[in-house]
Interface confidence: low
Amino acid sequence: DAHKSEVAHRFKDLGEENFKALVLIAFAQYLQQCPFEDHVKLVNEVTEFAKTCVADESAENCDKSLHTLFGDKLCTVATLRETYGEMADCCAKQEPERNECFLQHKDDNPNLPRLVRPEVDVMCTAFHDNEETFLKKYLYEIARRHPYFYAPELLFFAKRYKAAFTECCQAADKAACLLPKLDELRDEGKASSAKQRLKCASLQKFGERAFKAWAVARLSQRFPKAEFAEVSKLVTDLTKVHTECCHGDLLECADDRADLAKYICENQDSISSKLKECCEKPLLEKSHCIAEVENDEMPADLPSLAADFVESKDVCKNYAEAKDVFLGMFLYEYARRHPDYSVVLLLRLAKTYETTLEKCCAAADPHECYAKVFDEFKPLVEEPQNLIKQNCELFEQLGEYKFQNALLVRYTKKVPQVSTPTLVEVSRNLGKVGSKCCKHPEAKRMPCAEDYLSVVLNQLCVLHEKTPVSDRVTKCCTESLVNRRPCFSALEVDETYVPKEFNAETFTFHADICTLSEKERQIKKQTALVELVKHKPKATKEQLKAVMDDFAAFVEKCCKADDKETCFAEEGKKLVAASQAALGL
């Protein structure tokens, strides 16, 4: 299905609006520090060129690959060396090495200012004055801060962003209408970004096979009525889509995602009974809806797994003939029967099954050797079940904020070398598992909790990879994708850690804390908690609780004082002295 001009092909498939939006996202994800105006100029130049190719596919340079065209365009940026340093060296390379080089320089934690939300009236004026620029700016700001954001999904977010402003800027109470919608988009966007980051990490760090195994398990849970061949086809297509997006091939990715949605909707009878509503929606909503669709009901008459995978005399023959296919079938059959398991647990079970077959199919009596393989699954299933039960009990007892604090202490003691902002961000997100998943019935808790924790721990892994400081984090992150959570759970207090020198400045607070939102104030307190643990890793829960209670009372008292700044200065010194005494610092 070769086209004379790839750029013309994608322009025609996607349409001008989506083409321009996707090129902007691609450029902003690569050159994260470039000003908005520079990117718009580059996108306009690429778009004009694409139009000449649509008019005449044989025109000069129209036969070049998208990587060549886009890379050449990015390398025209005048300030590349000053702004990006060694990334400029990518421009000396030829494709495909040049694109790989750009990919390697994507920064998960770019040094960009926090996005501050202007007043509602200011935003509405900007929206009405120039809607197109306003929406482009949204794409640009999200893409540069989230360089792995799933591009076709970002188009869906932008559509909802536009709808929110269109509706709310006409409302009587603009703020009441708009702000909750923007909060929802922000929270959903962060979650979407983190989920996609795990997919890209899975592909890039652990290979296509790892991603395909994940996809077989997840799609089999979601579409338990679909045949194995159907699931395999969907997995192959989905892998192509995500490989493209994670590789910066956003036009191909968006195009192939649209094709996949079309295929799923045309074949929904053989895939799932839950797709009807999704398939009636416009393209962007349809793709999003399919990706989030609930699990179909399990077929009523599924036979025991043991027949084909334990009792059959042909197990080793089937395994030897096509190992990946046989293991894929095992994963499919197990997953469609277990929507109550997390995907990572299903992958651990498949791994255990495979290890057993490797050992047993070479034994004198294979059947005797693997006959009890399902018994080996029991402890693997019970471990996450018990962990979730204990943590949900703790969450229900403490509430979200204090549960986050418990996790902050736990993780700081495990990996105290990790930077304080990273520990705060990751522990806060780990703590959100409580409100997200503990409300669910038993049958939905594990897939909710453990697969969410995989996403959050991946955030820790990608942030740590940028500046590695802990061998323990590196070990848990790199050795096994599906065992990351058990690896971190198993870490005890790091006895090799030398406590941080006490620095009173770290615990000096000012009146500005009083004007912060509740969330920002929590983050300040949690930052102090992490620093306390880094100074005194052996502090007991009771000691830390006492200091944190004193700290909360101190902030409350000084925020009510007439002379707030003096209160923070004087009472702060007393608090530091009392805390040092309480913790023996």
């Epitope: 760090k205 652990f206 790892a210 992958l347 791994k351 290890t355």
Partner: nanobody, 115 residues
């Protein structure tokens, strides 16, 4: 059955070099990680170097700049080039290959650095 066999160990003078090889016989589904660990007498086994399927490498601080890990995907082989060897590098070196959630270990090869 999967078996890992290490080779290339031996006695070498301080400052010398050795190249360890590890070959996997049998088929392992979806290798994600290959690594070298070592264990000196009376000490814990420790990670020396590891390499993921995409070629990303990780080294223990004590060997950075001296040791290089590499792999040959087509042959299920992993190598460790050890230069500027020191007495404290003396240990049994083990090869480790992992996939979805478990690992396979070799029997180990002795490396002795002594004058």
């Amino acid at each position: 059955q999967v078996q890992l066999v290490e080779s290339g160990g031996g006695l070498v003078q301080p400052g010398g070099s050795l190249r360890l090889s590890c070959s996997a016989s049998g088929s392992i589904w979806g290798i994600y990680h290959m690594g070298w660990y070592r264990q000196a007498p009376g000490k814990q086994r420790e990670l020396v170097a590891s390499i993921t399927v995409d070629g990303s490498t990780h080294y223990a601080d004590t060997v950075k700049g001296r040791f290089t890990i590499s792999r040959d995907n087509s042959k299920n082989m992993v190598y460790l080039q050890m230069n500027s060897l020191r007495a404290e590098d003396t240990a049994v070196y083990y090869c480790d290959i992992r996939n979805v959630g478990g690992d396979y270990w070799g029997q180990g090869t002795q490396v002795t650095v002594s004058s």
